[in-house]
């Protein structure tokens, strides 16, 4: 069966610099040549788009210049990195994969990665 299953880790902890990375892997039915990957954030039943990128298989994954996401692709696997995260950005980050070409269009959605972001403690003033 070539039904598209999208896999992503259940939980990721962002670094102290507010960077979180995770892998979004999809079982591609057929041989798609154009794939769109979108990261959605779900919090309090609200879903918002964090970033999106379209890539041709074999080419690099490119997000918009002002995107908080970067990523690389390898086969049916996309390595996603989200930067600039703060504690208020904690939430469920869902990987959506769309096979845009060749037809027919096909959509797969992962179960989401819960990203926990903890703001770093401010450095205490030190007296010398």
């Amino acid at each position: 069966c070539k039904a598209m299953h999208v896999a992503q880790p259940a939980v990721v902890l962002a670094s102290s610099r507010g960077i979180a990375s995770f892998v979004c892997e999809y079982a591609s039915p057929g041989k798609a040549t154009e794939v769109r990957v979108t990261v959605l954030r779900q919090a309090d039943s609200q879903v918002t788009e964090v970033c999106a990128a379209t890539y041709m298989m074999g080419n690099e994954l490119t997000f918009l210049d002002d995107s908080i996401c970067t990523g690389t692709s390898s086969g049916n696997q996309v390595n996603l990195t989200i930067q600039g995260l703060r504690a208020m950005d904690t939430g469920l980050y869902i990987c959506k994969v769309e096979l845009m070409y060749p037809p027919p269009y096909y959509l797969g959605i992962g179960n989401g990665t819960q990203i926990y972001v903890i703001d770093p403690e401010p450095c205490p003033d030190s007296d010398f």
Epitope: K2, G30, K31
Partner: antibody, heavy 114, light 108 residues
Framework: EVQLVESGGGLVQPGRSLRLSCRGS????????ISWVRQAPGKGLEWLGF??????????DYVASVKGRFTISRDDSKFIAWLQMDSLKTDDTAVYYC?????WGQGTLVTVSS | QPVLTQPPSVSVAPGKTARISCGGN??????VHWYQKKPGQAPVLVIY???DRPSGIPERFSGSNSGNTATLRISRVDAGDEADYYC???????????FGGGTKLTVL
């Protein structure tokens, strides 16, 4: 509701031209290739050609039997695609569908006869 | 270009299971899609990527693909399933879609 609606079919004499239109609504029209498929009376489905999305530079491709006679184009700002048919022959008589393969129009009948 | 071979016709009694085959050389390596075509109506995608059902298509429709044959199964067939059924793959060599010749399903 997703829709593809064809128009422009009718009766035309052999050797003449006809332009079919396909208007899409309620889906990501500009992201998808738009194909034209026809079904002649008593025959199966025959893919004629398509215009790819802007990600592919709106390039076109055609089945050998219509290459040079048929031209497919699109205008994403109007959610519309066209099939320009020139030098029509009697065996071009068919119902013509535009499709993304997920979605299909209702078809428009083209009859080529003198 | 791949050649997809379908039986011209398949007959089945109401309530039984219809099986429509689509043969092609090593078709299991391709993603196979199935369309239902009723007279005077537009084709409808009923199975895509071998075995997935688009929303709105009943669970009675299922698909499989292995070896040199893809199969569309319609269980608990009723008169409303009478139609022509077409398999389709994408030819990666020419970057063009290819349809099978179609199978007329008759409900006895």
């Amino acid at each position: 509701e997703v829709q593809l609606v064809e128009s422009g079919g009718g009766l035309v004499q052999p050797g003449r031209s006809l332009r079919l239109s396909c208007r899409g609504s309620n889906f990501n029209f500009d992201d998808l290739a738009i194909s034209w498929v026809r079904q002649a009376p008593g025959k199966g489905l025959e893919w004629l050609g398509f215009v790819r999305s802007k990600a592919y530079g709106e390039t076109t491709d055609y089945v050998a039997s219509v290459k040079g006679r048929f031209t497919i184009s699109r205008d994403d700002s109007k959610f519309i695609a066209w099939l320009q048919m020139d030098s029509l022959k009697t065996d071009d008589t068919a119902v013509y569908y535009c499709t993304t393969f997920n979605y299909w129009g209702q078809g428009t009948l083209v009859t080529v006869s003198s | 270009q791949p050649v997809l071979t379908q039986p011209p016709s398949v007959s089945v009694a109401p309530g039984k299971t219809a099986r429509i085959s689509c043969g092609g050389n090593n078709i299991a390596s391709e993603a196979v899609h199935w369309y239902q075509k009723k007279p005077g109506q537009a084709p409808v995608l009923v199975i895509y990527y071998d075995s997935d059902r688009p929303s709105g298509i009943p669970e009675r429709f299922s698909g499989s693909n292995s070896g040199n044959t893809a199969t569309l199964r319609i269980s608990r067939v009723d008169a409303g399933d009478e139609a022509d059924y077409y398999c389709q793959v994408w030819d990666r060599t020419t970057d063009q879609p290819v349809f099978g010749g179609g199978t007329k399903l008759t409900v006895l």
